[in-house]
């Protein structure tokens, strides 16, 4: 008799999830000498232990603590780039500007980027059929709790000037319900962070509006100011050209004509 299996609203665990996590760990530790000491089998065991045999709507940050401990990593606290709804450009940027870091440039973020996972209560099986959707099923699911945990720790580690890339093409440029808006903003430490600098990335080629005046950016400024952190905002009008100028700042087109 086939066992009844809970059907969730979200996609199931990414295929070959254990192999992917292990392979990513090995690759990361080979590329980053400061993480060579990490035992990837232990990392996988800790990752697995966070959600296997547990109800996928009842995961806590505590479940991920063994993994957090194994993945402890020091990134320069003044070189942190947060992002919201514009992950690809943020990653392209840190690939060029190698001294800045997004969460996905850290070991734990790299391991889980773009993956889905969940288990089942009281069985050691990984559920490849479906996993809980944050909205339709529950928020305390393995993926959401993981990102909430690592995002909080990443924000807590930040210092000096923290940068955030925001998507100027969206109706809510700053969204209070995003991971940035609900977790990272509230976990920046005012005693360490002097300024949050937002980069609003424009979508349209001919869009010269000052999106730093957008009501949602003003809302972000208000939240940040109330936390005793200064706020700054820049429009990035041509993201493609911006990346080119990051690669080659001496290019004549990267300097305004007098």
């Amino acid at each position: 008799v086939p066992r009844w299996r809970q059907q969730w609203s979200g996609p199931g665990t990414t295929k070959r999830f254990p192999e992917t996590v292990l392979a990513r760990c090995v690759k990361y530790t080979e590329i980053h000498p400061e993480m060579r000491h990490v035992d990837c089998q232990s990392v996988w065991d800790a990752f697995k232990g966070a959600f296997i045999s547990k109800h996928p709507c009842n995961i806590t940050e505590e479940d991920y603590q063994p993994l957090m401990k194994l993945g402890t990593q020091t990134v320069p606290c003044n070189k942190i780039l947060l992002w919201s709804r514009i992950k690809d450009l943020a990653h392209q940027f840190t690939q060029v500007q190698r001294d800045m870091f997004t969460l996905e440039d850290t070991l734990l973020g790299y391991l889980a980027d773009d993956l889905t996972w969940c288990g089942e209560f009281n069985t050691s099986k990984i559920n490849y059929q479906s996993c809980p959707d944050w909205r339709k099923d529950c928020s305390n699911n393995p993926v959401s709790v993981f990102w909430k945990t690592v995002s909080r720790r990443f924000a807590e580690a930040a210092c000096d000037v923290v940068h955030v890339m925001l998507n100027g093409s969206r109706s809510k440029i700053f969204d209070k319900n995003s991971t940035f808006g609900s977790v990272e903003v509230h976990n920046l430490q005012p005693e360490k962070v002097q300024t949050l600098e937002a980069w609003v990335i424009h979508g349209g080629r001919e869009d010269s509006r000052d999106l730093c005046q957008d009501p949602t950016i003003k809302e972000l400024e208000s939240i940040i100011s109330k936390r005793n952190i200064q706020f700054s905002c820049k429009n990035i009008y041509r993201p493609d050209k911006f990346l080119q100028c990051v690669k080659n700042p001496e290019d004549s087109s990267c300097t305004s004509e007098i």
Epitope: K79, Q97, M100, V161, H163, T195, E197, D210, C212, S232, C233, K234, N235, I236, Y237, R238, K241, F242, C245, V246, P249, E250, S253, C254, T255, S256
Partner: nanobody, 117 residues
């Protein structure tokens, strides 16, 4: 704005010198060309000197040979050495990015320079 802080202005006689300094915070300073701008009473703000991250410089004709722009990326500062000042140099001076794809939307308080004849 805290991101850009200009200083060093003052009152001088024509022919005198002043050195303006600008401290910028934020990552864009390290990437972007930086410019000195000035706004004379009743006139538009204009860029008068620009320096790339690598130190290449360019000047408006009216200040060429008299003003020198330099930058120290380690200290995030841009300096404008102003020599042989003229009354028409009287203005509020500002620094900002001069990278076309990045909006120079935020400005510091500026620093006032008054040159009397």
């Amino acid at each position: 704005d805290v991101q850009l802080q200009e200083s060093g202005g003052g009152s001088v006689q024509a022919g005198g010198s002043l050195t303006l300094s600008c401290t910028a915070s934020g990552w864009l300073f390290r990437l972007a060309s930086m410019g000195w701008y000035r706004q004379a009473p009743g006139k538009e703000r204009e860029m008068i000197a620009v320096i790339t991250t690598g130190g290449r410089t360019n000047y408006k004709d009216s200040v060429q040979g008299r003003f020198i722009i330099t930058r120290d990326n380690t200290k995030s500062t841009v300096t404008l050495q102003m020599n042989r000042l003229k009354p028409e140099d009287t203005a509020v001076y500002y620094c900002n990015t001069s990278m076309p794809v990045v909006g120079a939307d935020e400005w510091g308080q500026g620093t006032r320079v008054t040159v009397s004849s």
